[in-house]
């Protein structure tokens, strides 16, 4: 058993049918010695008396808010949560496996640049009685500070007969050095509590591996005289690291017809302009990627050919 926060404790339970459970001793936070009784949640049934209460925690029915009283007055509370292990594996019931980029991916994180700021998000089908707490550091043995905000509900969507909820959190490395080679990964830890169930999820990454630039901005077309060709131009996104001479992007320019079946013409360039043939009813899209490290491409920025 360990303390998650004041008066909230997590019991680690290795569960299997007929498991003996964990013996837990609760102590009433009071100078009083006599006449103390214990109850669980809203029940008035007295579970025991005395300054300590010994319970055998075998299942969620044994978790909850234990309260010690004297003469009708509440003395203190202890909320017991369960962290359940089955077949040697800690439960991961609260969050949905996003399966991207691999199975058992519960947390996904992205950074728009090398500033040390990043966003992580996760999915759940649970709508109520749910809390998250996020901590982060660079490295784990001698951790350097990363400050995370509060996790917030960022999207809701319907998937079949299921409603899915997306939560996200923003974090910032306290002493980020954008140009430095990373040797220690960022560690992100999410505590999830649903009703009386505690679970924790972790992710470890280098900022360079989670970079996803914003789409190029100010995408414009300039027709070339007496030609079906156009000059496409764009700019680096505002959120990208500076100076651009050091933090350089490469770009992919795509001409796509109205039909998805039509052949796509693609041009790769390090410049912020390109000349392409603009077909009728086609659209031109441009996306960006770090020039020197193959992390994610940005989303497309698009304009119609007409």
């Amino acid at each position: 058993i360990w303390e998650l926060k004041k008066d909230v404790y997590v019991v680690e339970l290795d569960w299997y049918p007929d498991a003996p459970g964990e013996m837990v001793v609760l102590t009433c936070d009071t100078p009083e010695e006599d006449g103390i009784t214990w109850t669980l949640d809203q029940s008035s049934e007295v579970l025991g008396s005395g300054k300590t209460l010994t319970i055998q925690v075998k299942e969620f029915g044994d978790a909850g808010q234990y309260t010690c009283h004297k003469g009708g007055e509440v003395l203190s509370h202890s909320l017991l949560l369960l962290h359940k292990k089955e077949d040697g594996i800690w439960s991961t019931d609260i969050l949905k496996d996003q399966k991207e980029p691999k199975n058992k991916t519960f947390l996904r994180c992205e950074a728009k640049n090398y500033s040390g700021r990043f966003t992580c998000w996760w999915l759940t089908t649970i709508s109520t009685d749910l809390t998250f707490s996020v901590k982060s550091s660079r490295g784990s043995s001698d951790p350097q500070g990363v400050t995370c905000g509060a996790a917030t509900l960022s999207a809701e969507r319907v998937r079949g007969d299921n409603k899915e909820y997306e939560y996200s959190v923003e974090c910032q490395e306290d002493s980020a050095c954008p140009a430095a080679e990373e040797s220690l990964p960022i560690e992100v830890m999410v505590d999830a509590v649903h009703k009386l169930k505690y679970e924790n999820y972790t992710s470890s990454f280098f900022i360079r591996d989670i970079i996803k630039p914003d789409p190029p901005k100010n995408l414009q077309l300039k027709p070339l005289k007496n030609s079906r060709q156009v000059e496409v131009s764009w700019e680096y996104p505002d959120t990208w690291s500076t100076p651009h001479s050091y933090f350089s992007l490469t770009f992919c320019v795509q001409v796509q017809g109205k039909s998805k079946r039509e052949k796509k013409d693609r041009v790769f360039t390090d410049k912020t302009s390109a000349t392409v043939i603009c077909r009728k009813n086609a659209s031109i899209s441009v996306r960006a990627q770090d020039r020197y490290y193959s992390s994610s491409w940005s989303e497309w920025a698009s304009v119609p050919c007409s």
């Epitope: 569960w15 049918p17 029915g61 909850g64 089908t125 007969d161 299921n162 409603k163 009386l196």
Partner: nanobody
């Protein structure tokens, strides 16, 4: 929200078997841990057993262990309670419930309940 409807209750002789079904509709059934409870006249609702969302683990009250078996078919949104070697003291209204916590024997931990089906075991 999940709506639950029990069926399969009836009158049987002691020592016989009965299979109860609980059909779920509404939100995704496979997200929920499912439990069975029972209530005899003049008594509190009593835990019978529960099955986890994947159907891989079950947990039973001592009074029914070895006689009752819970299973589920997530493709058909149904949970079953197979009762054998029935005794007169098994007479009760049987309720199906859906919740998020497995295992739990407390009704507090179940969010959705069916209306119940009567099982009578005569001697």
């Amino acid at each position: 929200e999940v709506q639950l409807v029990e069926s399969g209750g009836g009158v049987v002789q002691a020592g016989e078997s009965l299979r109860l079904s609980c059909a779920a509709s509404g939100r995704s059934f496979s997200n929920y841990e499912m439990g069975w409870f029972r209530q005899a006249p003049g008594t509190e609702r009593e835990f019978v057993g529960t099955i986890n969302r994947r159907g891989s683990s079950t947990y039973y009250a001592d009074s029914v262990k070895g006689r009752f078996t819970i299973s589920r078919d997530n493709a058909k949104n149904t949970v079953f309670l197979q009762m054998s070697s029935l005794k007169p003291e098994d007479t009760a209204v049987y309720y199906c419930a859906a919740g998020w916590l497995f295992p739990s024997s407390l009704s507090r931990d179940y969010d959705f309940w069916g209306q119940g089906t009567q099982v009578t075991v005569s001697s």
